[in-house]
Interface confidence: low
């Protein structure tokens, strides 16, 4: 499995962002496909669970991402992206996308460095 992500992303506080992750695999996509999204804050701290997919999407039932993340992928297109809603400044950090598609061997984890920025002030 080979992972493709956008690398670095900048988004405005309070908006929504699509964390895009796609993959390649010699094996057909089937029921064994699993996708795990995790988050590590920019200022350090432990890794946090964001999202899990195995045949169906599983959103977090608690924690910082509860009610703020939804599945926006299409495995048939090798797309395992998610949408993160209502961005906050403490969403700054690194998001990882891990795809397993047996019998293909596990590949590298895709990473997205998200920077949440202030709303750009309107200037005449």
């Amino acid at each position: 499995v080979e992972i493709y992500t956008s690398g670095a992303l900048e988004a405005v506080n309070g908006t929504d962002v699509r964390l895009k992750c796609t993959f390649s695999s010699f094996a057909p996509v089937g029921d064994a496909l699993t996708v795990t999204w995790n988050f590590r804050p920019r200022d350090g701290g432990r890794e946090q669970f964001v999202f899990y997919y195995h045949m169906d999407p599983f959103r977090p039932m608690s924690g910082r991402f509860k009610d703020r993340v939804v599945w926006d992928g299409n495995p048939e297109r090798y797309d395992v992206s998610i949408l993160l809603w209502k961005l906050q400044f403490d969403d700054n950090g690194t998001y990882t996308c891990q795809v397993k598609n047996p019998p293909d061997v596990d590949g590298l984890v895709g990473t997205i460095r998200l920077s949440v920025v202030h709303t750009v002030p309107f200037s005449e």
Partner: antibody
Framework: EVQLKESGPGLVQPSQSLSITCTVS????????VHWVRQSPGKGLEWLGV???????DYNAAFISRLSISKDNSKSQVFFKMNSLQANDTAIYYC?????????????WGQGTSVTVSS | DIQMTQTTSSLSASLGDRVTISCRAS??????LNWYQQKPDGTVKLLIY???RLHSGVPSRFSGSGSRIDYSLTISNLEQEDFATYFC??????????FGGGTKLEIK
């Protein structure tokens, strides 16, 4: 060896429909999507639509009302049908395989079939 | 829809030259940029996908680079068979897949 081959009518009357078959070999339609792209005389490439391995389709919004794509996995054939053709639909029509990569690239193409819309 | 622009519609070069073909997207496409070669007989081949990854069987004299909205295809040590038309294509925001207008590489 991966191969795709389009077969079409060559000449179509205005207001009539166009049917093209893309026959593939070297891979299974149950594992790969197939795109349709056209190139009008002297112009660039224009994406028309795709049928995915599971049978779902995506179409270019400009053609969604008159385009349908279907397939027969067992015969390794993809079927393209466009209705209400006009002179500006004259083009070379290609089928292409959606690559096994996250970049959604079209990794193998047919040789194209030339279609002229004229009475 | 994302617009793809290849500002140079034709380019002349000699055998052995190094040439660069440019492509610009109307918005950030996150490296989801592919390059295709079309020969005069209409044959189309994928050269590079995801900005810089060489498709299998493509000679190493082809390379791709870029980020955000600006991308380029470089062919080093031009050979006779490289004289063709080159198209870029974005596959970030789908559908539709959109192509640049093409750059025709001609022999000087």
């Amino acid at each position: 060896e991966v191969q795709l081959k389009e077969s079409g009518p060559g000449l179509v009357q205005p207001s009539q429909s166009l049917s093209i078959t893309c026959t593939v070999s070297g891979f299974s339609l149950t594992r790969y999507g197939v795109h349709w792209v056209r190139q009008s005389p002297g112009k660039g490439l224009e994406w028309l639509g795709v049928i995915w391995s599971g049978g779902s389709t995506d179409y270019n919004a400009a053609f969604i009302s008159r385009l349908s794509i279907s397939k027969d996995n067992s015969k390794s054939q993809v079927f393209f049908k466009m209705n209400s053709l006009q002179a500006n639909d004259t083009a070379i029509y290609y089928c292409a395989r959606n690559g096994y990569d996250g970049g959604y690239a079209m990794d193998y193409w047919g040789q194209g079939t030339s279609v002229t819309v004229s009475s | 829809d994302i617009q793809m622009t290849q500002t140079t519609s034709s380019l002349s070069a000699s055998l052995g030259d190094r040439v660069t073909i440019s492509c610009r997207a109307s918005q950030d496409i996150s490296n989801y940029l592919n390059w295709y070669q079309q020969k005069p007989d209409g044959t189309v081949k994928l050269l590079i996908y995801y900005t810089s990854r060489l498709h299998s069987g493509v000679p190493s004299r082809f390379s791709g680079s870029g980020s955000r909205i600006d991308y380029s295809l470089t062919i080093s040590n031009l050979e006779q068979e490289d004289f063709a038309t080159y198209f870029c294509q974005q596959s970030d925001t789908l559908p539709p897949w959109t192509f640049g207008g093409g750059t025709k590489l001609e022999i000087k």
